[in-house]
């Protein structure tokens, strides 16, 4: 599965779009800063196998896609940029899905390290609750946008796993 090239290209494009989506100066939102605790240490301390890396990256992108697909998100961002960003994520999901099926085989689903999936889910739970608590304010969305950009950059260890031959 020739994922690394296409994935990193799409990942870069998504990050550029996410950067362009910024509407407010981050300095005007300093009071809204929040520690979301991306599970960086867990990821960095682990040597991911390819199938594991694909599953965890898929979960991260799927949760990001869901987050930016809500009505509240539509109201917060410039529509054409949001659509381009969502399309980019959707394509990444397609790439990763194709790889899961190719790596695993259609019928068989091996055990994966569910704790990493759960760590990603909990991280996005914290983001979701933060947005709700802040009533989806423009500053809250700006904080989340910056956080997602960071998390995309953090997942380098996962991307190393993509290049590994299981």
């Amino acid at each position: 599965c020739d994922l690394p090239q296409t994935h990193s290209l799409r990942n870069r494009r998504a990050l550029i779009l996410l950067a362009q989506m910024g509407r407010i100066s981050p300095f005007s939102c300093l009071k809204d800063r929040h520690e979301f605790r991306f599970p960086e240490e867990e990821f960095d301390g682990h040597q991911f196998q390819k199938t594991q890396a694909i599953s965890v990256l898929h979960e991260m992108i799927q949760q990001t896609f869901n987050l930016f697909s809500t009505e509240d998100s539509s109201a917060a961002w410039e529509q054409s940029l949001l659509e381009k960003f969502s399309t980019e994520l959707y394509q990444q999901l397609n790439d990763l899905e194709a790889c899961v099926i190719q790596e695993v085989g259609v019928e068989e689903t091996p055990l994966m390290n569910e704790d990493f999936i759960l760590a990603v889910r909990k991280y996005f739970q914290r983001i979701t609750l933060y947005l709700m608590e802040k009533k989806y304010s423009p500053c809250a969305w700006e904080v989340v946008r910056a956080e997602i950009m960071r998390s995309f950059s953090f997942s380098t260890n996962l991307k190393k796993g993509l290049r590994r031959k299981d």
Epitope: S55, L96, E97, V100, T109, K122, F124, Q125, T128
Partner: antibody
């Protein structure tokens, strides 16, 4: 609106297998993990496992590992839960419940499917 | 496995009274991942409270939740006839996800 519609009641003999379906509508099927929870008569709720409809990966509770198989058909937005080597203790109502985050976690449930295991 | 123990098993109260239901976890649960469900006979469970203290959509304000770590509480300030049901706490803080055994709230 989100709807989860399950297949009808089943009566099975000990040792047999049962396959329960859960058809989803009203949302993008591939975007949310689907869970299975069961409830024996007069008893509490028990989580069995979950499936990601997008690529089919599963996570099962240790208790059901080796006996349960969760699958999905993206063309019909349906997930399936198959339980094999049935015994009388497996008599229960089986529910599918959609995952999500915040207020969406298990906010949507199927109506339940009664599986009776009896000789 | 995180065992959730609910108490009391049965609570007999009259409409208008205050109900306090407890859920004790065998090990610490992140408050973000502690939920409460209500179930009536012949029905699927219904989400009441998410993340310990947040009311789900359409749930009346007489319901409230609190707690942290290993001890969580569901409170119904003034019971209405439709509140008599079984209540379950649930955690998805670690695998396998678990539910309490339930508290049956019955009319005295």
């Amino acid at each position: 609106q989100v709807q989860l519609v399950q297949s009808g009641a089943e009566v099975k003999k000990p040792g047999a297998s049962v396959k329960v379906s859960c058809k989803a509508s009203g949302y993008t099927f591939r975007n949310y993990w689907m869970h299975w929870v069961r409830q024996a008569p007069g008893q509490g709720l028990e989580w069995m496992g979950e499936i990601n409809p997008s690529h089919g990966r599963t996570i099962y509770a240790q208790k059901f590992q080796g006996r349960v198989t969760m699958t999905r058909d993206t063309s019909t937005s349906t997930v399936y839960m198959e339980l094999s080597s049935l015994r009388s203790e497996d008599t229960a109502v089986y529910y599918c419940a959609r995952g999500g985050l915040g207020p969406a976690w298990f906010a949507y449930w199927g109506q339940g499917t009664l599986v009776t295991v009896s000789s | 496995e995180i065992v959730l123990t609910q108490s009391p098993a049965t609570l007999s109260l009259s409409p208008g009274e205050r109900a306090t239901l407890s859920c004790s976890a065998g090990s610490s649960v992140d408050s973000s991942e502690l939920y409460w469900y209500q179930q009536k006979p012949g029905q699927a469970p219904r989400l009441l409270i998410y993340s310990t203290s947040n009311l789900a959509s359409g749930i009346p304000a007489r319901f409230s939740g609190s707690g942290s770590g290993t001890d969580f509480t569901l409170t119904i300030s003034s019971l209405e006839p439709e509140d008599f049901a079984v209540y379950y706490c649930h955690q998805w803080s670690s695998y396998p996800f678990t539910f309490g055994q339930g508290t049956k709230l019955e009319i005295k």
